[in-house]
């Protein structure tokens, strides 16, 4: 996601499962810290946003032709799992220790 | 990158190494097809944008709170190498068959 002014970084995003309709099958937790990647991918791309070569190229082309080519985008580059208690197909409460890809571990410019 | 109206997809982006100042060390090719990921990550996220669970969650939160949380972003999810002839540290023209991460192979919503 983009954000005015600040550079690409991980910010808080608390998600309530009721808000997204997932409370129908996720029993617990009621909410969790998903985090969000926010901020711009500005030249020069710093090491901490682990840019790919393509992101570096796109950033340089954007510098030269800002109206033609967009900046690279600040996105999750590494995700972490959370533990959930959910209803299985039979409606039985089941604990899944590692429900993958739910929380941002790292952000970067891509 | 984002794009008004159209959904996340791979579009052409021809990059001239002179435009980004890399012609000082890349001898050939003079330009190449880098591609760019353009378009929006709209609800519901289609399978072809290979959304992560976090991207799906963020999309749902954005639907509920559009001013608070951004949409997922359309970015390269798989990159390909290109062959380059470059000047090594001694200035000797050297062929690198696979200079990784230079061209978009696939785009997705992250």
């Amino acid at each position: 996601s983009t954000g005015a002014g600040s550079h690409c970084q991980k910010t808080s995003l608390r998600v309530n499962f009721e808000d997204i309709g997932w409370n129908s099958w996720i029993i617990a937790p009621k909410e969790y810290e998903a985090y969000e990647c926010k901020g711009g991918c500005f030249f020069p791309l710093a090491d901490d946003v682990t840019p790919t070569k393509h992101a570096i190229v796109q950033t340089l082309v954007h510098l030269k032709f800002p109206t033609k080519v967009g900046k690279a985008c600040c996105v999750p580059t590494k995700l972490s799992p959370i533990s959930i208690l959910y209803k299985d197909d039979m409606g039985v409460p089941t604990l899944k220790y590692h429900y993958e890809g739910m929380s941002v571990a790292e952000c970067g410019c891509r | 990158s984002t794009g008004a109206g159209s959904h996340c997809q791979k579009t052409s982006l021809r990059v001239n190494f002179e435009d980004i100042g890399w012609n000082s060390w890349i001898i050939a090719p003079k330009e190449y097809e880098a591609y760019e990921c353009k378009g929006g990550c709209f609800f519901p996220l289609a399978d072809d944008v290979t959304p992560t669970k976090h991207a799906i969650v963020q999309t749902l939160v954005h639907l509920k709170f559009p001013t608070k949380v951004g949409k997922a972003c359309c970015v390269p999810t798989k990159l390909s190498p290109i062959s380059i002839l470059y000047k090594d540290d001694m200035g000797v023209p050297t062929l690198k068959y696979h200079y990784e991460g230079m061209s978009v192979a696939e785009c997705g919503c992250r």
Partner: antibody, heavy 120, light 109 residues
């Protein structure tokens, strides 16, 4: 339609010189690598070297370095392979091939081959 | 002696699945991509697979490539009489391109 057309078969004597050609058409000749591959009778493929016609940059296999010269004339979209002094062991089929645009290590179009026979 | 090692010959009956192996080292296959070529008798080689597992347009999906560590393999399913040919693997080693010695595929009558 992409085509690589090679010059005809040659019969030469040991010690003679030779230059065979490979003419590209149907694509931008200067921006694709052209490789040369040898195939001795009944044997496998051997990579000889490669050239980027735009600047005539070449890279040779260590086995062929100094034995042959690879060149190109971009004005007529033609690549060349030449010997200054042929040996009987140079008897083989020689193929030119075009490297894929972004991947010079994969040859997507091939010439029909030029058979070179060196015999006294 | 080729840098990449292939079996001299393999065979299979029509409709069967055959695989051709290609063994190298960390400096070639281990660190780089693999291509496969088919050479029908009396003709120039044809690119079948590039970048380990990608097929150029026009190559049937009966042909597939894979790579693991310092080895690669070509699989041909639903073997047909017209698949009888020599098959070569290739990879890169620094600035150089290297071929396997070739494998003759015989389709049993």
């Amino acid at each position: 339609e992409v085509q690589l057309v090679q010059s005809g078969a040659e019969v030469k004597k040991p010690g003679e010189s030779l230059k065979i050609s490979c003419k590209g058409s149907g694509y931008s000749f200067t921006t694709y690598w052209i490789g040369w591959v040898r195939q001795m009778p009944g044997k496998g493929l051997e990579w000889m070297g490669i050239i980027y016609p735009e600047g005539s940059y070449t890279t040779y296999s260590p086995s062929f370095q100094g034995q042959v010269t690879i060149s190109a004339d971009k004005s007529i979209s033609t690549a060349y392979l030449q010997w200054s002094s042929l040996k009987a062991s140079d008897t083989a089929m020689y193929y030119c091939a075009r490297g894929k645009r972004v991947d010079a290590s994969s040859f997507d179009y091939w010439g029909q081959g030029t058979l070179v026979t060196v015999s006294s | 002696q080729s840098v990449l090692t292939q079996p001299p010959s393999v065979s299979g009956a029509p409709g069967q699945r055959v695989t051709i192996s290609c063994s190298g080292s960390s400096s070639n296959i281990g660190d780089n991509y693999v291509s496969w070529y088919q050479q029908l008798p009396g003709t120039a080689p044809k690119l079948l697979i590039y970048r380990n597992n990608k097929r150029p347009s026009g190559v049937p999906d009966r042909f597939s490539g894979s790579k693991s560590g310092t080895s690669a393999s070509l699989a041909i399913t639903g073997l047909q009489a017209e698949d009888e040919a020599d098959y070569y693997c290739s990879s890169t080693d620094k600035e150089h391109l290297v071929f396997g010695g070739g494998t003759k595929l015989t389709v049993l009558g």
